[in-house]
């Protein structure tokens, strides 16, 4: 194994794959078909599966921008430098174990994945082997937003984006030079992982809701 | 090459404090998940916590209010402050840095030499 | 609180021999669990992640199987380097539990 600088593997693996290594949505592979015995999955188990897809599909688009540029040798330092305003977890979010608020983490996970979704819209031409994983991903975040907004409660609280708002930082991203662009996709991929790492972390926290059936891999 | 140094450990007494550090050469850390891990003399791993990049904590049940991990990526060090010691918190502890694709699955990979902490009168 | 169990507590085998150590989760954890190596008065080592994948440098002979509650690992062939204790830890969640490896085998010399 070799790794990139963010401590990635970039050579593991990738999950719900199939025969042509493409990321298959969970649900939709061979496996899960061929499984009449296995118990319907609990919408915790959904949203837990969709965000580990999601995640393998990251690690994937990881793989190919770390292979075609340096970008993942640069330092946090120099990546701060670039000013885009990608959504974080803070403890103030509820999603940590520390100060922990099931509703307001909720709402900040639904918020922060809608307010990712002009950056996923910015990845689909970003990358040519990984065309396909880039779509998948963008896609799977859209439905696993379907699956949280079923979830949560306090529907009003989430604010979502304003579309000429998105359609203006879109152009202006897409407006970059090519150092710039490599250094965004590299930021946005990096930050999504981290938010839906922290989103996870979060969603097992809910009363430890979420327990994957035994053979759902 | 990377490497993990752990200081601070010593004989305190029961009731005491004591900050552990773990300074890390070769790598930026702020691109890591970090670990704190203890064995007691003869006994096997006990693992104390974890922070993550997005600076989140999480502590084992026994360690939550006594224990408090942080980190300062500018300096390139993880720390853990122990509090209110007893005789069992007696052991080597060990950092860690991890990497981790889900959630909590993060694969310990590097590990300090460790720093003993006796806590006894 | 998810809880990891490993068996046997203590092995006792000669070289050649083929070794298996189980580690049993109170709950489903898919395959996020990794195996650990360790040697009387050193820091451990990972041999394996995501159930059955070998980290880089770690001898074939060693491999991981399992998912959901039932992990194995296996020395096909033991060495003498190879008499250490082993951990599994578990990485499903870290919420709400004591801890998250499981209480170690020794794997001595017969």
């Known amino acids: 194994d070799y790794k990139d600088h963010d401590g990635d593997y970039k050579d593991h693996d990738i999950d719900y794959k199939d025969d042509d290594d493409k990321l298959v949505p969970p649900g939709e592979d061979s496996k899960d078909v061929a499984a009449p015995h296995r118990q319907p999955l609990t919408s915790s188990e959904r949203i837990d599966k969709q965000i580990r897809y999601i995640l393998d599909g990251i690690s994937a688009l990881r793989k190919e921008t770390c292979n075609k540029s340096n970008m993942c040798e640069s330092s946090k330092e120099a990546l701060a430098e670039n000013n885009l305003n990608l959504p974080k977890m803070a403890e103030k979010d509820g999603c940590f174990q520390s100060g922990f608020n099931e509703e307001t983490c909720l709402v900040k996970i639904i918020t922060g994945l809608l307010e990712f979704e002009v950056y996923l819209e910015y990845l689909q031409n970003r990358f040519e082997s990984s065309e396909e994983q880039a779509r998948a991903v963008q896609m799977s975040t859209k439905v696993l937003i379907q699956f949280l907004q079923k979830k949560a409660k306090n529907l009003d609280a989430i604010t979502t984006p304003d579309p000429t708002t998105n359609a203006s930082l879109l152009t202006k991203l897409q407006a970059q030079n090519q150092w710039l662009q490599d250094m965004t996709t590299h930021l946005i991929l990096r930050s999504f992982k981290e938010f839906l790492q922290s989103s996870l972390r979060a969603l097992r926290q809910m009363g430890d809701l979420i327990s994957v059936p035994v053979d759902s891999r | 090459e990377v490497q993990l140094v752990e200081s601070g450990g010593g004989l305190v007494q029961p009731g005491g404090s004591l900050r552990l550090s773990c300074t890390v050469s070769g790598i930026d850390l702020s691109s890591y998940d970090l670990s704190w891990v203890r064995q007691a003399p003869g006994k096997g791993l006990e693992w104390v916590g974890y922070i993550y990049t997005d600076s989140s904590t999480w502590y084992a049940n026994w360690a939550k209010g006594r224990f408090t991990i942080s980190r300062d990526n500018s300096k390139n060090t993880l720390y853990l402050q122990l509090n209110s010691l007893r005789a069992e918190d007696t052991a080597v502890y060990y950092c860690?840095?991890?990497?981790?694709?889900?959630?909590?699955?993060?694969?310990?990979?590097?590990w300090g030499q460790g720093t003993l902490v006796t806590v006894s009168s | 609180d998810i809880q990891l169990t490993q068996s046997p507590s203590f092995l006792s085998a000669s070289v050649g021999d083929r070794v298996t150590i189980t580690c049993q989760a109170s709950?489903?954890?898919?395959?996020?669990l990794s195996w650990y190596q360790q040697k009387p008065g050193k820091a451990p080592k990972l041999l394996i992640y995501r159930a059955s994948t070998l980290t880089s440098g770690v001898p074939s002979r060693f491999s991981g199987s399992g998912s959901g509650t039932e992990f194995t690992l296996t020395i096909s062939s033991l060495q003498p380097e190879d008499f250490a204790t082993y951990y599994c830890q578990q990485g499903y969640n870290s919420n709400d539990v004591d801890n998250v490896f499981g209480g170690g085998t020794k794997v001595e010399i017969k």
């Open positions: 860690a840095r991890g990497s981790t694709d889900y959630a909590f699955d993060t694969r310990l990979d590097l």
């Open positions: 709950q489903s954890i898919s395959n996020e």
